[in-house]
Amino acid sequence: MAVTACQGLGFVVSLIGIAGIIAATCMDQWSTQDLYNNPVTAVFNYQGLWRSCVRESSGFTECRGYFTLLGLPAMLQAVRALMIVGIVLGAIGLLVSIFALKCIRIGSMEDSAKANMTLTSGIMFIVSGLCAIAGVSVFANMLVTNFWMSTANMYTGMGGMVQTVQTRYTFGAALFVGWVAGGLTLIGGVMMCIACRGLAPEETNYKAVSYHASGHSVAYKPGGFKASTGFGSNTKNKKIYDGGARTEDEVQSYPSKHDYV
């Protein structure tokens, strides 16, 4: 039961995280005009990964896309790439994890396959989350650098009579959405990886406890160990008895008696 819960929760957390990464990537408020030096501005500037916007005194907001690829800063391109990679990996991870969910039955898919898919999606979510966090952090670092550069310019370039206020930019809402979303995706991925350990058919005989009740019908073979012991050389859980006893896979197909692992 705990495995299913962990896997399901990991999936939901990752889903929310990836939705957040997509939202952050599409948002226009990656950087917003710093109003500290000019709190009375009637023209408010903010920028995203794909376009920059200006909200004017009429309440009208005009946005213009960056219609150039080569003319954009390399850092911005890198952030775009990281966010897109994060979204793509996350989307693939979601697709894989849907089929890996223990509560969803697809044909006669073995638990080992589900475990592998859970691990794969978990790793994808972790990388996706890291990409988003990295992308947002790179952009934030870029903002901090530019902020202090423009602050320096503001106080050194004031030789003339005309007062001009240089626009400085600070962290926009998208950065916080991106950090939180990346973190959630990362956590979801870790949860999926943890769930994978519980799903994987372990190479111990703890499942043999299911044979306690059928002790009377067990036929012993020379040199064999009693199936109910769970110890000894039978590490592969091979069938060492006759008389209607079931294989590991057959046992596993029954209602989840061992979900507590």
Partner: antibody
Framework: QVQLQQSGPQLVRPGASVKISCKAS????????MHWVKQRPGQGLEWIGL????????RLNQKFKDKATLTVDKSSSTAYMRLSSPTSEDSAVYYC????????WGQGTLVTVSS | DIQMIQSPSSLTVTAGEKVTMSCKSS????????????LTWYQQKPGQPPKLLIY???TRESGVPDRFTGSGSGTDFTLTISSVQTEDLAVYYC?????????FGAGTKLEIK
């Protein structure tokens, strides 16, 4: 096209508050902020303040902070300006203006403060 | 507050003449976000509300005759009427649309001989 219809002229006693209305039509009322402008007879234009009809957030010129109160009624697409404790200095034509670049202006409301 | 200084305060010209009026702001009205100057020109005829002529310092509003031209950047702006018509008799105001409180110049009164 943008149309702003203002209430008629008002004669008020000093100290008695007055409320001017401005009904908007021809555009989405909540899209653009509503500005109010004062013009004393034979004088220039003076910006009073603005209100965002979508959330009723206001920004007032400090000079009119204790004088003007801006409100909106979204259901009727109407903006209001209330002038408190008017004096002869408040006798003027008051305009509401909206849309991008204040493209649309009301016809003006003449407020006369007289005892 | 940004001060808007208009000159001259009044002009008397004959129809067909070219007219230039100036507007200076105490601070730059150039927005670095989109490289636009947030200065607007209005025309107010007697007994009427102001009418938008020019925005972004040089962009003519649709329907405004092309004899009206706005120019300038930063703090110095100009409105030019290439060939004055009798219907241009009005007061012309420049407005700071960049910083609160939005401020208007005192106006330039255009009179026709």
């Amino acid at each position: 096209q943008v149309q702003l219809q203002q209430s008629g002229p008002q004669l008020v006693r000093p100290g008695a508050s007055v409320k001017i209305s401005c009904k908007a039509s021809g555009y989405s009322f909540t899209t653009y902020w509503m500005h109010w402008v004062k013009q004393r007879p034979g004088q220039g234009l003076e910006w009073i303040g603005l209100i965002d009809p979508s959330d009723s957030e206001t920004r007032l010129n400090q000079k009119f902070k204790d004088k003007a109160t801006l409100t909106v009624d979204k259901s009727s697409s109407t903006a209001y300006m209330r002038l408190s404790s008017p004096t002869s200095e408040d006798s003027a034509v008051y305009y509401c203006a909206s849309n991008r670049w204040l493209l649309g202006w009301g016809q003006g409301t003449l407020v006369t403060v007289s005892s | 507050d940004i001060q808007m200084i208009q000159s001259p305060s009044s002009l008397t010209v004959t129809a067909g003449e070219k007219v230039t009026m100036s507007c200076k702001s105490s601070q730059s009205l150039l927005n670095s976000g989109n490289q636009k100057n947030y200065l607007t020109w209005y025309q107010q005829k007697p007994g009427q509300p102001p009418k938008l002529l020019i925005y972004w310092a040089s962009t003519r509003e649709s329907g405004v005759p092309d004899r009206f031209t706005g120019s300038g950047s930063g703090t110095d702006f100009t409105l030019t009427i290439s060939s004055v018509q009798t219907e241009d008799l009005a007061v012309y105001y420049c407005q700071n649309d960049y910083s609160y409180p939005l401020t208007f110049g005192a106006g330039t009164k255009l009179e026709i001989k």
